[in-house]
């Protein structure tokens, strides 16, 4: 099995979507919460996050392939207040698992534009076959 987290962003007109995606097997979802933090270098948790999403096992999804669950945080109009360092994280206290995505930044420029930097590939957690699956 394998659980991993990615961070991405998409732009729709003036809106900026910050997206945290957790890739997991169907049976691994239960007990996980995905959350997005801003300017929380050491204490990113659901309690201190901008938004959180509790994953549920979807009984309608068949098969044992990898599926994804997404948390989306939408900024309707980026302002200087949105400048800062962001991080996607996921946690299951039930299993003691913590995933921390790469830090990425929003920088609001003097010209009224903004840039998003630091988005990288998945940070993942591998499970060997003899450990079974999470439930």
């Amino acid at each position: 099995g394998c659980i991993n987290i990615t961070s991405s962003a998409s732009q729709e007109g003036t809106r900026l979507n910050l997206i945290c995606t957790v890739w997991h097997k169907k049976e691994e979802a239960e007990g996980f919460v995905v959350f997005l933090c801003k300017d929380r270098s050491g204490d990113c948790s659901p309690e201190t996050s901008l938004k959180q999403l509790r994953l549920k096992r979807d009984p309608g999804i068949d098969g044992v392939g990898e599926i994804s669950s997404q948390l989306m945080f939408t900024i309707s109009q980026v302002t200087p207040l949105h400048s800062g360092t962001y991080q996607c994280c996921a946690r299951s206290q039930k299993s003691g698992i913590r995933l921390q995505g790469h830090f990425f930044s929003i920088l609001f420029t003097e010209t009224g534009n903004y840039t998003v930097t630091g988005l990288k590939q998945r940070q993942h957690l591998e499970f060997s076959h003899n450990e079974g699956t999470l439930s």
Epitope: E30, R54, K94, G96, I97, L99, L125
Partner: antibody, heavy 112, light 106 residues
Framework: QVQLKESGPGLVQPSETLSLTCTVS????????INWFRQPPGKGLEWMGT???????DYNSALKSRLTISRDTSKSQVFLKMNSLQTEDTAIYFC??????WGQGASVTVSS | DIQLTQSPSLLSASVGDRVTLSCKGS??????LAWYQQKLGEAPKLLIY???SLQTGIPSRFSGSGSGTDYTLTISSLQPEDFATYFC????????FGAGTKLEIK
């Protein structure tokens, strides 16, 4: 098969340091985190601290100043060290994989 | 810190009875509530997590419900092996246990 086993001294002198080891099998400590809990005789349960799969730690604020949790992933062992023990620290100490699979517990008596 | 109050502290019941145990938080737990069963001299066993998710291998006669600060564990038809002490645990902010409900044979 997931298994956890606590080991350590059954008797500790007041003011001394308690050292406990949790040895796990059937899973990797880099994939799952370990909690330490304790239960005084005839009483309820108390969470002490967590070492996550990534090695980060969280502690119960009431115990934080005298508690350290660490691990040796190559030996599949997690360690609890708590200093300045008093008689009220007498308890059964449990390690658990997250919240789900628990060891049988190690009895610790603090007495002179 | 979140405090949990369990009631009753002692419950007498018979095999086949439907019983309900209560757990009340001092503040919102956001459904991050688990239930454990503990028998004398044994480690606690996880029954329910996230309010109503049944742990693998636990019989379906156990169920959980609730929201906000108020939560319940229901055993639909008591079996002889169910007589034990039950603890609730909040995992919304750290971990805090209730004092327990002892379920004894009437």
């Amino acid at each position: 098969q997931v298994q956890l086993k606590e080991s350590g001294p059954g008797l500790v002198q007041p003011s001394e340091t308690l050292s406990l080891t949790c040895t796990v099998s059937g899973f990797s400590l880099t994939n799952y985190g370990i909690n330490w809990f304790r239960q005084p005789p005839g009483k309820g349960l108390e969470w002490m601290g967590t070492i996550w799969n990534d090695g980060g730690t969280d502690y119960n604020s009431a115990l934080k100043s005298r508690l350290t949790i660490s691990r040796d992933t190559s030996k599949s062992q997690v360690f609890l060290k708590m200093n300045s023990l008093q008689t009220e620290d007498t308890a059964i100490y449990f390690c658990a994989r997250g919240m789900e699979a628990w060891g049988q517990g190690a009895s610790v008596t603090v007495s002179s | 810190d979140i405090q949990l109050t369990q009631s009753p502290s002692l419950l007498s019941a018979s095999v086949g009875d439907r019983v309900t145990l209560s757990c009340k938080g001092s503040q919102n737990i956001n459904n991050y509530l688990a239930w454990y069963q503990q028998k004398l001299g044994e480690a606690p066993k996880l029954l329910i997590y996230n309010t109503n998710s049944l742990q693998t291998g636990i019989p379906s006669r156990f169920s959980g419900s609730g929201s906000g600060t108020d939560y319940t564990l229901t055993i639909s038809s008591l079996q002889p092996e169910d007589f034990a002490t039950y603890f609730c645990l909040q995992h919304n902010s750290g971990y805090t246990f209730g004092a327990g409900t002892k379920l004894e044979i009437k």
